[in-house]
Interface confidence: low
């Protein structure tokens, strides 16, 4: 068992010409979310076929409103990872589909509307427990940057999450030939010797002397790639001669569960439900007591003095599960106030506060303008957990330190010419127009659209805009 994790880094216009228009507008604000679909093997399957390895949906991203006329930037993303749990062995090869969806937040009847913005797909080889793999995929004019990895959930380890960890029998080291279970250094890999020559990349075993193949590989030692071109049946043990998948018995045929365990089929394997006193993939391990150290992550074992009595694990903070094998997502309780970002450091929780808030849980609302100076006569305006400067004429920027070019916005209408001036701007109007920005036509009879021109100012004279 384990978890496939996907981290979206950015979604925005790809390089080159033809940048896409932003999917959001002032009239139609929207937010993004993502869906990932995983399938085992390297098959080119239709998007509609089931996500046999699992699927996940992200949270909604922040609401975004496009500035008119601006090209689409990288769009704001949802926080966090997309996580797809898998119960059986990690197949090693997989296909993925990542969809970017837009949720429109206008005044639609019946609530928000969803539309698919982009879909990317790929086929990859990936070992569980490895580092993050980075990827860039393009869909039309859009570009998606993301990372992914597969990690095993304790007690499973290995590239396919099929090897198991057990508590150390000796305090200082593992038995001969057995490695510590990274990252659980206080545990050791369970002794399991596969058939000699079994491919370490494409094969695994759950019983000593066995060699079972990951999807896409066949042969007695799992060294022959499967050729699907001439194969008809999708199921069964691999044929070493043809490299094809041929019909065979189901995973529960012959009941692989020992000691009275009951077998149930899973999409690609089987699962044993064990009677009390037995555990393991096939219920082959018997008589668990507190002496066997069944509690992971420093859990305290109580009861279970003899094989027929149940034990209970009392878990330390941050862990849960019957064997303290699951790490608690302490951020799921949303301890950070005022939109703060929760970080689980392992040894502590930390909140990264939004601008304008402080405190261990971002509970204090700061005086946004305290200690914030606006230069060149600007005044500080509070609001929304952030300060902003209202700048004096002729200055701009976050702190009014930049000298503004008042003519940059072409404020003079109807062909008027703009001149920068220490107190603002001056428009010299083209013949036939007048006003501070040359916005008023002068009527042919000499009357203007204004009630009257200011004393001493002829139509066509430069007008100072103060």
């Amino acid at each position: 068992a384990g978890v496939f994790e996907l981290q979206i880094h950015s979604f925005g216009p790809g390089p080159g010409p033809g940048a896409p228009r932003s999917p959001c507008s002032a009239r139609l604000p929207c937010r993004l979310f993502f869906r990932v679909c995983l399938k085992p093997g390297l098959s080119e399957e239709a998007a509609e076929s089931p996500c046999a390895l699992g699927a996940a949906l992200s949270a909604r991203g922040p609401v975004y409103t496009e500035q008119p006329g601006a090209p689409a930037p990288d769009l704001p993303l949802p926080d966090g990872l997309l996580q797809v749990p898998f119960r059986d062995a990690w197949p090693g090869t997989f296909s993925f589909i990542i969809e970017t969806w837009r949720e429109e937040l206008g005044d639609q009847i019946g609530g928000p509307a969803w539309s698919l913005l982009a879909r990317v797909a790929g086929r990859r080889r990936l070992a569980a427990g490895g580092p993050w793999a980075r990827d860039i995929q393009r869909a039309g004019a859009w570009e998606l940057r993301f990372s992914y990895r597969a990690r095993c959930e304790p007690p499973a380890v290995g590239t396919a999450c099929t090897r198991l960890c057990r508590p150390r029998s000796a305090p200082s080291r593992c038995g001969p030939g057995l490695r510590p279970c990274a990252p659980l250094e206080d545990e050791c890999e369970a002794p399991l010797v596969c058939r000699a020559g079994c491919s370490p990349e494409h094969g695994f075993c759950e019983q000593p002397g066995e060699c079972r193949c990951l999807e896409g590989w066949t042969g007695p030692l799992c060294t022959v790639p499967v050729s699907t071109s001439s194969c008809l049946s999708p199921r069964g043990p691999s044929s070493a001669t043809t490299g094809c998948l041929v019909p065979g018995p189901g995973p529960c045929d012959g009941n692989p569960c020992a000691n009275g365990g009951s077998c149930s089929e899973t999409p690609r394997s089987f699962e044993c439900t064990c009677p009390r006193g037995f555990y393991g993939l096939r219920c082959e391990v018997s008589g668990v007591t507190c002496a066997d150290g069944p509690c992971f992550n420093g859990g305290l074992c109580v009861g279970g003095a003899d094989p027929d009595s149940a034990y209970i694990c009392h878990c330390p903070p941050g862990f849960q599960g019957s064997n303290c094998e699951k790490r608690v997502d302490r951020c799921s309780l949303q301890p950070c106030r005022n939109g703060g970002l929760c970080l689980d450091l392992g040894h502590a929780l930390r909140c990264r506060c939004r601008a304008g808030f402080a405190g261990p849980r971002c509970e204090h609302d700061l005086d946004d303008c305290a200690g914030r100076a606006c230069a060149n006569g600007g005044t500080c305006v509070e609001g929304g957990g952030a300060h902003r400067c209202s700048c004096a004429l002729g200055f701009g920027g976050r702190d009014c330190r930049e000298r503004a070019d008042p003519c940059a916005a072409r404020p003079c209408a109807h062909g008027g010419r703009c001149y920068a001036h220490f107190s603002g701007l001056v428009c010299a109007c083209a013949p036939g127009y007048m006003g501070a920005r040359c916005e008023f036509p002068v009527h042919p009879d000499g009357a203007s659209a204004l009630p009257a021109a200011p004393p001493g100012l002829r139509p066509g004279d430069p007008q100072r805009y103060l």
Epitope: H9, S10, D74, W132, R145, L343, G346, R350, R352
Partner: nanobody, 124 residues
Framework: EVQLVESGGGLVQPGGSLRLSCAAS????????MGWFRQAPGKEREGVAD???????SYADSVKGRFTISRDNSKNTLYLQMNSLRAEDTAVYYC??????????????????WGQGTLVTVSS
Amino acid sequence: EVQLVESGGGLVQPGGSLRLSCAASGDTYRSYCMGWFRQAPGKEREGVADIVSDGSTSYADSVKGRFTISRDNSKNTLYLQMNSLRAEDTAVYYCAVDRGGSGGYCYTGRYDYWGQGTLVTVSS
């Protein structure tokens, strides 16, 4: 790909100082969150300090007031100034990078690139 190379580790007496450096190279298309982690023999790896692209920092309680994290963006280098070192600071120190999503936040625990580590030994 991003490559991280730590340097500056070594043997120092209790109360002494060391400065660790971490040089980053490779694909730097996004602003980073960078952090220092350490792993003492037989213990879990733990966060020491991190710094966001906007310059804000945070520290583990055990090193607050003694360690200072900083970064030089022009050199793509991260530093950890360690003062008043104690025996319990002995560990392999790792530099890590998180090229997290939007907002320049540190998603601690989701660092996607790690250095090989540099050993710091505090002993008399």
